[in-house]
Interface confidence: medium
Amino acid sequence: KNSFTKLSIEPAFTPGPNIELQKDSDCCSCQEKWVGYRCNCYFISSEQKTWNESRHLCASQKSSLLQLQNTDELDFMSSSQQFYWIGLSYSEEHTAWLWENGSALSQYLFPSFETFNTKNCIAYNPNGNALDESCEDKNRYICKQQLI
Amino acid sequence: PSTLIQRHNNSSLNTRTQKARHCGHCPEEWITYSNSCYYIGKERRTWEESLLACTSKNSSLLSIDNEEEMKFLSIISPSSWIGVFRNSSHHPWVTMNGLAFKHEIKDSDNAELNCAVLQVNRLKSAQCGSSIIYHCKHKL
């Protein structure tokens, strides 16, 4: 069983104040106003930011823009109609789409990734769709903290 | 839906619900937010079926305690039943514990629509027999 216990932190529009995440043997703790799911914590913004602004906001909270393990990772919000910035960008050096931690995008995650404009950033809809947009466009964003 | 409400308000059921939760744990595949656990259903049910489905999970049909929670839930899921109903259009909207629900519910003047649904950041009335996605909640 996963479990998540509340920490009484109240953020304003950004993901929240810096906080060391607490772990115990059977509990994952997420900050107030973050969502806990499968022992990950997610901050789902309702405010629109550029990709870089989003990346910095997540980083300032000891988290990163969403890195997807698989397309059902955000199963709990698969009926959402919004698109969100995720932590995927094109590396000229590696000529590949990379996540923020440097790992490469699996070709199975977004079969259409070859059509993405490499100058753009990637916005993701939790039902599994992704599209490339100018990084200067403003979108909602999702931060992720992996607890295990 | 009044007969089901009486069953839902039965104190032994409430006790069982409380005993099923311990150590602040959420069941697998549920999400947590602000000290509550949520089951985000994908199945469509009538309002009464949804009530029973949540009861079988030792939880309650989605209740919305404040507008911050409503905004969060609207991000997660554009539409779902909530635990607010009325016996007829001549009766007030009430929550599962029988308290009057004071916030605006759209289309309330339609006598056919006596169960409430959260729909894209808005509370609306709907036919209780409609098949709509449901979510369950329990407080930690």
């Epitope: 109240e10 953020p11 304003a12 529009f13 107030e32 106003k33 309702s46 405010e47 629109q48 109609q81 909602r140 | 404040n66 507008e67 911050e68 409503m70 905004k71 609207s74 004071k102 916030h103 605006e104 759209k106 894209v120 950041n121 808005r122 509370l123």
Partner: antibody, heavy 118, light 107 residues
């Protein structure tokens, strides 16, 4: 009857500060998000800031971010806007407005004039 | 930020006319759009929310339609008290934004 009454406006020099207040009555203030909206003379409406019912969520327009601070005191049924580093372009009538559980602004105050001029 | 473009910016009409004002969003906002009426020296007044829902107490000659990016406010038969400025507003995402306004004048 729902009432929102703004106060605290006036003339201030560029770089100066002002604190606006909005006194609410006739509804359960602590259940509602509140907003500030402004309107420069002869211009359209511009949303300034929002604060959720228990202050957990706060939002600002880019034009005021870092200079203005929204806050509320639910015990006093009051909403505030602290405005620092004021500029000429902040000159406007400032309105406070109520949200009804995600509905747009269903009640507005009468507005208060803020003039930033040397 | 989501930009809202209203058209026309101003229009002249007569009592009894049917009037349509449009509002276009720079990106999809589902049905999260409101319409307000403002008279000189007064605060705005909410007319329509959710793109098409009439606020209680607002005359039924006002109606709204649309979803996604294109929205319309219609006044079916203009009354003398309807001459004012009308604004659309999106509340899909922060920052919230208003259209630039449409001034409705007596012909």
């Amino acid at each position: 009857e729902v009432q929102l009454v703004e106060s605290g406006g006036g003339l201030v020099k560029p770089g100066g500060s002002l604190r606006l207040s909005c006194a609410a009555s006739g509804f359960t203030f602590s259940s509602h998000s509140m907003n500030w909206v402004r309107q420069a003379p002869g211009k359209g409406l511009e949303w300034v800031s929002a604060i959720s019912s228990s202050s957990s969520y706060i939002y600002y327009a880019d034009s005021v971010k870092g200079r203005f601070t929204i806050s509320r005191d639910n015990a006093k049924n009051s909403l505030y806007l602290q405005m620092n580093s004021l500029r000429a372009e902040d000159t406007a009538v400032y309105y406070c407005a109520r949200e009804e559980w995600g509905l747009p602004f269903d009640y507005w105050g009468q507005g208060i004039l803020v003039t930033v001029s040397s | 930020a989501i930009q809202l473009t209203q058209s026309p910016s101003s229009l002249s009409a007569s009592v009894g006319d049917r009037v349509t004002i449009t509002c276009r969003a720079s990106q999809g906002i589902q049905s999260a759009l409101a319409w307000y009426q403002q008279k000189p020296g007064k605060a705005p007044k909410l007319l329509i929310y959710d793109a098409s829902s009439l606020k209680s107490g607002v005359p039924s000659r006002f109606s709204g339609s649309g979803s996604g990016t294109d929205f319309t406010l219609t006044i079916s038969s203009l009354q003398p008290e309807d001459f004012a400025t009308y604004y659309c507003q999106q509340f899909n995402s922060y920052p919230l934004t208003f259209g630039q306004g449409t001034r409705l004048e007596i012909k």
